[in-house]
């Protein structure tokens, strides 16, 4: 009786379970009753990760550097190509195909979470009591001046872009 | 017990035709591939041609590839090899060898195909 | 098709001996290769399947082992029944082919 199933790791043609080519294989002749599947290694920049049927394996990732790409681990017969971005840039998206520049937090926003390779920076405003008056990727939001601590009084408040500036007490007379 | 048993060889002239028969018993024939390996005196072992358990499959080597036709009656428990156009290097013992899983496990006692004139 | 290549063609040995026989492929095989053996005037006998595996009712004295392109039987005594040629047969790539032999003679 033919089978209509096939273990793990085999595939069903012409009524025969037939092994599947392994990782870093492709596939060149189906099995018969009498030879087993035909596989072939997958050539330079080439690969497949996974038990497969495949006649032909996938090309690797290029990474191209016109795009901000460099590649961060590279491929093998089994693994495709990670490319991941320059410094001071982040990919656009899980599969990295593109980079763009971190986007800077503007002034009255400071920097919560650093850009990384594969994420933006993440911005929050600033909270009273703190400014940022540059427009950064990697500045925090800073706290206003303590003027008491320096024996000053507060001649202008504080905003979320500016600092306190503080000034000599008034002196009795 | 499984028994695998040819016959059918002889002398026959270069160009002409011989059919051999391999008769089986002991065992569920259809559900089983089966083949022809020969072996020319004092050589090496050569496989001809194998057929799957339904007859939808059938394997030539090269050598006998346009000339021999190997087929089955699972209802007689009989597998054949029809051989046409004869030649001298098809003088060879002919074995007849059940298929189970990639191997040969059993095989019959031979046949000797003389192709002369 | 994959041409097998077997080493040595002939070996002497006595009863006792250790005996290896190699076979080589022209591509890669991966393990699948069967080992028989042949007496004069008898049809072949399955003796190693896919490599490393014993045939049932074959003496635990024989093992196969390889993969790849380089395949070995190995006979760890030597017993007078055992002299005989030797084939291997690979089931890689169609048609399945045998190597040429490897005849174990008494010394």
């Known amino acids: 009786e033919p089978p209509t199933a096939c273990r793990e790791k085999q595939y069903l043609i012409n009524s025969q379970c037939c092994s599947l080519c392994q990782p870093g294989q492709k596939l060149v002749s189906d099995c018969t009753e009498f030879t087993e599947t035909e596989c072939l290694p997958c050539g330079e920049s080439e690969f497949l990760d996974t038990w497969n049927r495949e006649t032909h394996c996938h090309q690797h990732k290029y990474c191209d550097p016109n795009l901000g790409l460099r590649v961060q681990q590279k491929g093998t017969s089994e693994t495709d190509t990670i490319c991941t971005c320059e410094e001071g840039w982040h990919c656009t998206s899980e599969a990295c195909e593109s980079c763009v520049l971190h986007t800077p937090c503007i002034p009255g926003f400071g920097v919560m979470e650093m850009a990384t390779e594969t994420t933006d920076t993440v911005c929050e405003p600033c909270p009273v009591g703190f400014f940022s008056n540059v427009s950064s990727a990697f500045e925090k939001c800073h706290p206003w001046t303590s003027c008491e601590t320096k024996d000053l009084v507060v001649q202008q408040a504080g905003t979320n872009k500016t600092d306190v500036v503080c000034g000599p007490q008034d002196r009795l007379r | 017990e499984v028994q695998l048993l040819e016959s059918g060889g002889g002398l026959v002239q270069p160009g002409g035709s011989l059919r051999l028969s391999c008769a089986a018993s002991g065992f569920t024939f259809s559900s089983y591939a089966m083949s022809w390996v020969r072996q020319a005196p004092g050589k090496g072992l050569e496989w001809v041609s194998g057929?799957?358990?339904?007859?939808?499959?059938?394997s030539y080597a090269d050598s006998v590839k346009g000339r021999f036709t190997i087929s089955r009656d699972n209802s007689k428990n009989t597998l054949y090899l029809q051989m046409n156009s004869l030649r001298a290097e098809d003088t060879a013992v002919y074995y007849c060898?059940?298929?189970?899983?990639?191997?040969?496990?059993?095989w019959g006692q031979g046949t000797l195909v003389t192709v002369s004139s | 098709d994959i041409q097998m290549t077997q080493s040595p063609s002939s070996l002497s040995a006595s009863v006792g001996d250790h005996v290896t026989i190699t076979c080589r492929a022209s591509?890669?095989?991966?393990?699948?290769l069967n080992w028989y053996q042949q007496k004069p005037g008898k049809a072949p006998k399955l003796l190693i399947y896919a490599a490393s595996s014993l045939q049932s009712g074959v003496p635990s004295r024989f093992s196969g082992s390889g993969s790849g392109t380089d395949f070995t039987l190995t006979i760890s005594s030597l017993q007078p029944e055992d002299f005989a040629t030797y084939y291997c047969?690979?089931?890689?790539?169609?048609?399945?082919?045998f190597g040429q032999g490897t005849k174990l003679e008494i010394k």
């Open positions: 057929i799957g358990g339904s007859s939808s499959y059938t």
């Open positions: 591509q890669s095989i991966s393990s699948y």
């Open positions: 047969q690979q089931y890689g790539s169609a048609p399945p082919t």
């Open positions: 060898a059940r298929y189970y899983s990639y191997h040969m496990d059993y």
